[in-house]
């Protein structure tokens, strides 16, 4: 058993049929010595008396809010949560496996630049009695500070018969050094509590590996005289690290109709302009990627050809 | 050229060669990006490699103030990785293809280090750790880790030279 936060404790249980469970001793936080009784949740049934209560925790029915009283007055609470371990593996029932970029990916994180700011998100089908708390650091043995905000519900989607909820959190490294080569990864830890079930999820990454620039901005077209060619120009996204002579991007420019199966024109460039062939009913799209490190491409920025 | 005396390097040549190094580092093992090597406990390897750190003056302001600190750090790293790529880790079994990008990568690391420090001038170099994996699978894992780490190192070096070529070239 360990303390998650004040008066909230996590009991780690091996979860299999007829498992013996864990013996837990609860102590009432009071100077009082006698006349103390214990109850669980809303029940008035007295579970025991005395300053300590010894219980055998085997299942979710044994978890919950234990309260010690004296003469009708509440002295203190202890909330017991369960953390299940099945076949040596901690349960992951609360969050959905996003399967990208690999199986057992519950947390996904992205950064728009090298400033040390990043966003992580996760998915669940649970809509109520759900809380998250997020901690992060750079490195684990001698951790350096990363400050995370509160996790918030950022999107709701309907998937077949199910509703899916996306939560996200923003974090900022306290003393970020955008130009340095990271040697220690960022660690992100998410505590998830659903009713009386506790789970924790972790992710470890370098900012450089989760970079995904915003799409290029201000796409403009200039038709070239006596030609089907068009000069397309764009700018670096506002959110990208500066100066751009140091933090450079490379770009992919594509002309395509509405369907992916349609014919297209495509060219890669380090410049912020390119000449392409425009067709009626087609769109010109541009996306960006770090020039020197193969992290994710941005989403496309598009303008119609006509 | 970035000689210990403090004259300027051939920024544009360094830029071209460092960008080539980036391409080669990813070509040498593009799939490295799909392996989560941190799960393999890499303290003994990648903790020993020289990293370009915050105080090394490789940020735009540091380069403007005095690029020598940064260039010396990059030079150290280039020599370190050049030695690693020439070591038993890469020359032993399972043997690499004669024409794999690792060969070009090795040569280009040497080429860039020579651009930064012509013969006859000496900067301190870091000792290369004695990493002698006994099993081919260990060697393979070590290669992945070294290349992964090299990808990060040459990305910073390429930014430094691109910025230098754009803003510090005479």
């Amino acid at each position: 058993i360990w303390e998650l936060k004040k008066d909230v404790y996590v009991v780690e249980l091996d979860w299999y049929p007829d498992a013996p469970g864990e013996m837990v001793v609860l102590t009432c936080d009071t100077p009082e010595e006698d006349g103390i009784t214990w109850t669980l949740d809303q029940s008035s049934e007295v579970l025991g008396s005395g300053k300590t209560l010894t219980i055998q925790v085997k299942e979710f029915g044994d978890a919950g809010q234990y309260t010690c009283h004296k003469g009708g007055e509440v002295l203190s609470h202890s909330l017991l949560l369960l953390h299940k371990k099945e076949d040596g593996i901690w349960s992951t029932d609360i969050l959905k496996d996003q399967k990208e970029p690999k199986n057992k990916t519950f947390l996904r994180c992205e950064a728009k630049n090298y400033s040390g700011r990043f966003t992580c998100w996760w998915l669940t089908t649970i809509s109520t009695d759900l809380t998250f708390s997020v901690k992060s650091s750079r490195g684990s043995s001698d951790p350096q500070g990363v400050t995370c905000g509160a996790a918030t519900l950022s999107a709701e989607r309907v998937r077949g018969d199910n509703k899916e909820y996306e939560y996200s959190v923003e974090c900022q490294e306290d003393s970020a050094c955008p130009a340095a080569e990271e040697s220690l990864p960022i660690e992100v830890m998410v505590d998830a509590v659903h009713k009386l079930k506790y789970e924790n999820y972790t992710s470890s990454f370098f900012i450089r590996d989760i970079i995904k620039p915003d799409p290029p901005k201000n796409l403009q077209l200039k038709p070239l005289k006596n030609s089907r060619q068009v000069e397309v120009s764009w700018e670096y996204p506002d959110t990208w690290s500066t100066p751009h002579s140091y933090f450079s991007l490379t770009f992919c420019v594509q002309v395509q109709g509405k369907s992916k199966r349609e014919k297209k024109d495509r060219v890669f460039t380090d410049k912020t302009s390119a000449t392409v062939i425009c067709r009626k009913n087609a769109s010109i799209s541009v996306r960006a990627q770090d020039r020197y490190y193969s992290s994710s491409w941005s989403e496309w920025a598009s303008v119609p050809c006509s | 050229r970035a000689v210990p005396g403090g004259s300027s390097p051939a920024w544009t040549q360094c830029q071209q060669l460092s960008q080539k190094l980036c391409t080669l580092a990813w070509s040498a093992h593009p799939l490295v990006g799909h392996m989560d090597l941190r799960e393999e406990g890499d303290e003994e390897t990648t903790n020993d490699v020289p990293h370009i750190q915050c105080g090394d003056g490789c940020d735009p302001q540091g380069l403007r103030d005095n690029s020598q600190f940064c260039l010396q750090r990059i030079h150290q790293g280039l020599i370190f990785y050049e030695k690693l790529l020439g070591s038993d880790i890469f020359t032993g079994e399972p043997s690499l293809l004669p024409d794999s990008p690792v060969g070009q990568l090795h040569a280009s690391l040497l080429g860039l280090s020579q651009l930064l420090q012509p013969e006859g001038h000496h900067w301190e170099t870091q000792q290369i750790p004695s990493l002698s994996p006994s099993q081919p699978w260990q060697r393979l894992l070590l290669r992945f880790k070294i290349l992964r780490s090299l990808q990060a190192f040459v990305a910073v070096a390429a930014r430094v030279f691109a910025h230098g070529a754009a803003t510090l070239s005479p």
Partner: antibody, heavy 118, light 107 residues
Framework: EVQLQQSGADLVRSGASIKLSCTAS????????MHWVKQRPEQGLEWIGW????????EYAPKFQGKATMTADTSSNTAYLQLSSLTSEDTAVYYC???????????WGAGTTVTVSS | DIVLTQSPATLSVTPGDSVSLSCRAS??????LHWYQQKSHESPRLLIK???QSISGIPSRFSGYGSGTDFTLSINSVETEDFGRYFC?????????FGAGTKLELK
Amino acid sequence: EVQLQQSGADLVRSGASIKLSCTASGFNIKDYYMHWVKQRPEQGLEWIGWIDPENGDTEYAPKFQGKATMTADTSSNTAYLQLSSLTSEDTAVYYCNATKELRYFDVWGAGTTVTVSS
Amino acid sequence: DIVLTQSPATLSVTPGDSVSLSCRASQSISINLHWYQQKSHESPRLLIKFASQSISGIPSRFSGYGSGTDFTLSINSVETEDFGRYFCQQSNSWPLTFGAGTKLELK
């Protein structure tokens, strides 16, 4: 199966013109760009130009402007290359090519050998 | 026009050898470079697009890398069916241009 059938070899007199054909099967040429590429004996490849059969748009390499004319007939699923004022320099194999992506050459015809005699 | 220089002009190899063919552009072309194989009396066929992207149906022994001005086509363990000419082609700007080719022949 995507295939391109090119017209047979031709021997033509210097100064004359010739029209080569390239008929597609297994796909509709409207959905592709059609290119023509020249290869002289024991030489490299030279790009002549492309046509978008959907709208008749064309783009020529400067070297072939005035020498080559590309057309396409979507009803017969055929692309054509006309070469005018032929000289011995035009003796070559001419390949037609169909591609979904404009700037590289995906599906090649077997080529038509054109020999210009004086 | 962008000029592509291929080297060597001829490469004599034994089946089982691994080889690298080089293509150098007269100016930076990012990764807008493609590789073709042409066997004797046949049409060319696309091997690699955009410097390193593989083409379905092409054996995995063919790989490409490079960006900017220097590009390489590697053939890991040459097979007898690989003999012929190899061309690079740039698509960075019009007109599209090809290299003069490298002839891969039996030693």
